[in-house]
């Protein structure tokens, strides 16, 4: 493994439709890819009216945009879908939304706001 | 590498059975979702349900529920179609595929494709 | 069900040209998004996956992008070996559905 990369070979499993599907509704998934493809983990919900419903969770396969993220945190503004993903065995186990802020000057200090977590 | 290797050619009579095979050799078979695919001469794909072997129990498309049973046996990594009551429309090329994942990321190998003809 | 839709059915194109699928979901299906190419009387191959993925051995000149009920598949510069039928297949939820296809022609 390449040093300071987080090896991911499982990951938390959950179906919200899992009875439609026939599956279980939660477990652990381990990932499999090709040997020089990286392996991620990735949370997908909702929100509906302040209360979280997951949807998805599960194993993601070499996606840039999951590259080198230890946290799994959701950073678009308000999407219809929530998914963020992570490097890290069963780093899908908690997930957050941390909007991105459009960059304007401050008239005062920046605040940086914790990120809410969910899990 | 995974592969995936099915049954040979059916012809079939309408109202008979077909049971497809499909034999996985590389990784972990017990752990892959296996899907299966038809395709009808000159048409498009149909998700026919899936299978995650160590889970045992198989998912289908409503429209072939109660006339589809997708199995695996895991001590010979095959996975298996059997689609009764046949009919000439079930005249297709059937594809056993593994999925990426569990969470049915993509559809990344195919078997070669089992052709079965239904006619009297 | 999830109903697909692509646009267009057929088109035509040169060696060299960029190309655009479109593929629409009848409900949203958040990146559970895949792109397969077939040849005729070969199985399809998965071309991308999660709505802008490429697996490997898949050519950059492939590109996906969409989320939730609108996707897009853009092949730049053309290849004489990307002539083929394009289908989009969503698994976001059961039952997986296909798109009905776009076929890609010479021109």
């Known amino acids: 493994a390449i040093l300071g990369r987080s090896e991911t070979q499982e990951c938390l499993f959950f179906n919200a439709n899992w009875e439609k599907d026939r599956t279980n509704q939660t477990g652990v998934e381990p990932c499999y890819g090709d040997k020089d493809k990286r392996r991620h983990c990735f949370a997908t919900w909702k929100n509906i009216s302040g209360s979280i419903e997951i949807v998805k969770q599960g194993c993601w396969l070499d996606d840039i945009n999951c590259y080198d993220r230890t946290d799994c945190v959701e950073k678009k503004d308000s999407p219809e879908v929530y998914f963020c993903c992570c490097e890290g065995n069963m780093c899908n186990e908690k997930f957050s939304y941390f909007p991105e802020m459009e960059v304007t000057q401050p008239t005062s200090n920046p605040v940086t706001p914790k990120p809410p977590y969910y899990n | 590498q995974v592969q995936l290797v099915q049954s040979g050619a059916e012809v079939k009579k309408p109202g008979s059975s077909v049971k497809v095979s499909c034999k996985a050799s590389?990784?972990?078979?017990?752990?892959?979702?296996i899907s299966w695919v038809r395709q009808a001469p000159g048409q498009g794909l149909e998700w026919m349900g899936g299978?995650?072997?160590?889970?045992?129990?198989?998912n289908y498309a409503q429209k072939f529920q109660g006339r589809v049973t997708i199995t695996a046996d895991e001590s010979t990594s095959t996975a298996y179609m059997e689609l009764s009551s046949l009919r000439s429309e079930d005249t297709a090329v059937y594809y056993c595929?593994?999925?990426?994942?569990?969470?049915?990321?993509?559809?990344?190998?195919w078997g070669q494709g089992t052709m079965v003809t239904v006619s009297s | 069900e999830i109903v697909m839709t692509q646009s267009p059915s057929s088109l035509s194109a040169s060696v060299g040209d960029t190309v655009t699928i479109t593929c629409r979901a009848s409900?949203?299906?958040?990146?559970?998004l895949a792109w397969y190419q077939q040849k005729p009387g070969k199985a399809p191959r998965l071309l991308i996956y999660?709505?802008?993925v490429l697996p490997s051995g898949v050519p950059s000149r492939f590109s996906g992008s969409g989320s939730g009920t609108h996707f897009t598949l853009t092949i730049s510069s053309l290849q004489p070996e990307d002539f083929a039928t394009y289908f989009c297949?969503?698994?976001?939820?059961?039952?997986?559905?296909f798109g009905p296809g776009t076929k890609l022609e010479i021109k």
């Open positions: 590389g990784e972990s078979f017990e752990h892959f979702q």
């Open positions: 299978i995650i072997p160590i889970y045992g129990t198989a």
């Open positions: 999660g709505a802008r």
């Open positions: 409900q949203g299906v958040s990146r559970w």
């Open positions: 297949q969503q698994s976001y939820s059961t039952p997986f559905t």
């Open positions: 595929v593994k999925d990426l994942t569990w969470t049915n990321l993509g559809l990344d190998i």
